[in-house]
Interface confidence: medium
C-alpha cells in the first residue's frame, strides 16, 4: 500500500508511518515501528507536558521565586505548569507574572478606592470635601470628618483633605 502523507488526530508521521503521539504528562522514548507501538514515559517530578506530543524532554515547572515576591497559586502536575501569583501586598508586573512589585500606598489626602489584587495595583482617590486621610496606606479609605454637632460641640478648626475637624465647646454667651 501507498505510505500515508497525513495522519489522524493524535498521530504523527515518521518514516512513512503514522505513530501515536504521547498523551499529556508523558514524553516520547521511541517512535513506533511496523511492529511496535510508540513508547512513552511519564514526566518526572517537577516536570510537565500539557499537549499530545512527540517531545523527548518534559518541560520544567515554573519556579515561583519568593525573592521576587512570588508564591505558588496552583501547584503543577505532570500535565500542567505551576501557576505563580504575588504575595499579599504585591501585584504581577506582567500577565505571565514573572515578578511582582509592591502595591502603591495612597498618600495623605488620598484614600483607597480599590484595594490591590494579585494582578492590579491599588486605586487611590482624592478625599472629597467632608472626608480626610492623614495616613500613607494601601488599605485605608478616606474617613468622614467628625460631626461636631452630634456631640453638641462646634467646629473650632475646619477639616481638610488631610486633617479632621477640631471640635470645641459651644460659646455660651451667644444666643
Amino acid at each position: 500500500p501507498e505510505p500515508p502523507t497525513a495522519c489522524r488526530e493524535k498521530q504523527y508521521l515518521i518514516n512513512s508511518q503514522c505513530c501515536s503521539l504521547c498523551q499529556p504528562g508523558q514524553k516520547l522514548v521511541s517512535d513506533c515501528t511496523e511492529f511496535t507501538e510508540t513508547e512513552c514515559l511519564p514526566c518526572g517530578e517537577s516536570e510537565f507536558l500539557d499537549t499530545w506530543n512527540r517531545e523527548t524532554h518534559c518541560h520544567q515547572h515554573k519556579y515561583c521565586d519568593p525573592n521576587l515576591g512570588l508564591r505558588v497559586q496552583q501547584k503543577g502536575t505532570s500535565e500542567t505548569d505551576t501557576i505563580c501569583t504575588c504575595e499579599e501586598g504585591w501585584h504581577c508586573t506582567s500577565e505571565a507574572c514573572e515578578s511582582c512589585v509592591l502595591h502603591r500606598s495612597c498618600s495623605p489626602g488620598f484614600g483607597v478606592k480599590q484595594i490591590a489584587t494579585g494582578v492590579s495595583d491599588t486605586i487611590c482617590e482624592p478625599c472629597p470635601v467632608g472626608f480626610f486621610s492623614n495616613v500613607s496606606s494601601a488599605f485605608e479609605k478616606c474617613h468622614p470628618w467628625t460631626s461636631c454637632e452630634t456631640k453638641d460641640l462646634v467646629v473650632q478648626q475646619a477639616g481638610t483633605n488631610k486633617t479632621d475637624v477640631v471640635c470645641g465647646p459651644q460659646d455660651r454667651l451667644r444666643a
Epitope: N67, L68, G69, G89, S99, C100, V101, L102, H103, R104, S105, S107, P108, D121, N134, V135, S136, S137, A138, F139, E140
Partner: nanobody, 120 residues
C-alpha cells in the same frame, strides 16, 4: 532617621509561643502600614504579615495564617507579632519593615532582626 528595633526572639520548642515587638522611631508610626518579613537560614526573604496604618486591616501568608497575629499600638509606636503553635520551619530571623510607597523588593526600612529558633 528611621529606626526599627525588633526584640522578643529566642529558642522555643515546637508548639510553643513567642511575642515579637518592634519599636519604631524617626517617622510618624501611626501614618504607615507596617509588616513582618522573615529570612530562614540559607533562604530568601519571605513576607509574613502586614497591618494597615490604623490596625483595621491585617493580612497573613498562608504558611502562618491561624497561628500568627499581627497588631500595633500607635500610642507606643510599637508593632507586634504573636506567634503560636510554632513549627521548625518558622525558624528564621524576623524583621519588621516600614512599608514603602511602591516599587520592587527589598523593603525600604527594616531593623536588624530578631532570631527565632524552633527546636526540641
Amino acid at each position: 532617621e528611621v529606626q526599627l528595633l525588633e526584640s522578643g526572639g529566642g529558642l522555643v520548642q515546637p508548639g510553643g509561643s513567642l511575642r515579637l515587638s518592634c519599636a519604631a522611631s524617626g517617622f510618624t508610626f501611626s501614618s504607615y502600614d507596617m509588616k513582618w518579613v522573615r529570612q530562614a537560614p540559607g533562604k530568601g526573604l519571605e513576607w509574613v504579615s502586614t497591618i494597615s496604618a490604623s490596625g483595621v486591616f491585617t493580612y497573613y501568608a498562608d504558611s502562618v495564617k491561624g497561628r500568627f497575629t499581627i497588631s500595633r499600638d500607635n500610642s507606643k509606636n510599637t508593632l507586634y507579632l504573636q506567634m503560636n503553635s510554632l513549627r521548625a520551619e518558622d525558624t528564621a530571623v524576623y524583621y519588621c519593615a516600614k512599608r514603602e510607597h511602591a516599587g520592587q523588593p527589598p523593603f525600604d526600612y527594616w531593623g536588624q532582626g530578631t532570631l527565632v529558633t524552633v527546636s526540641s
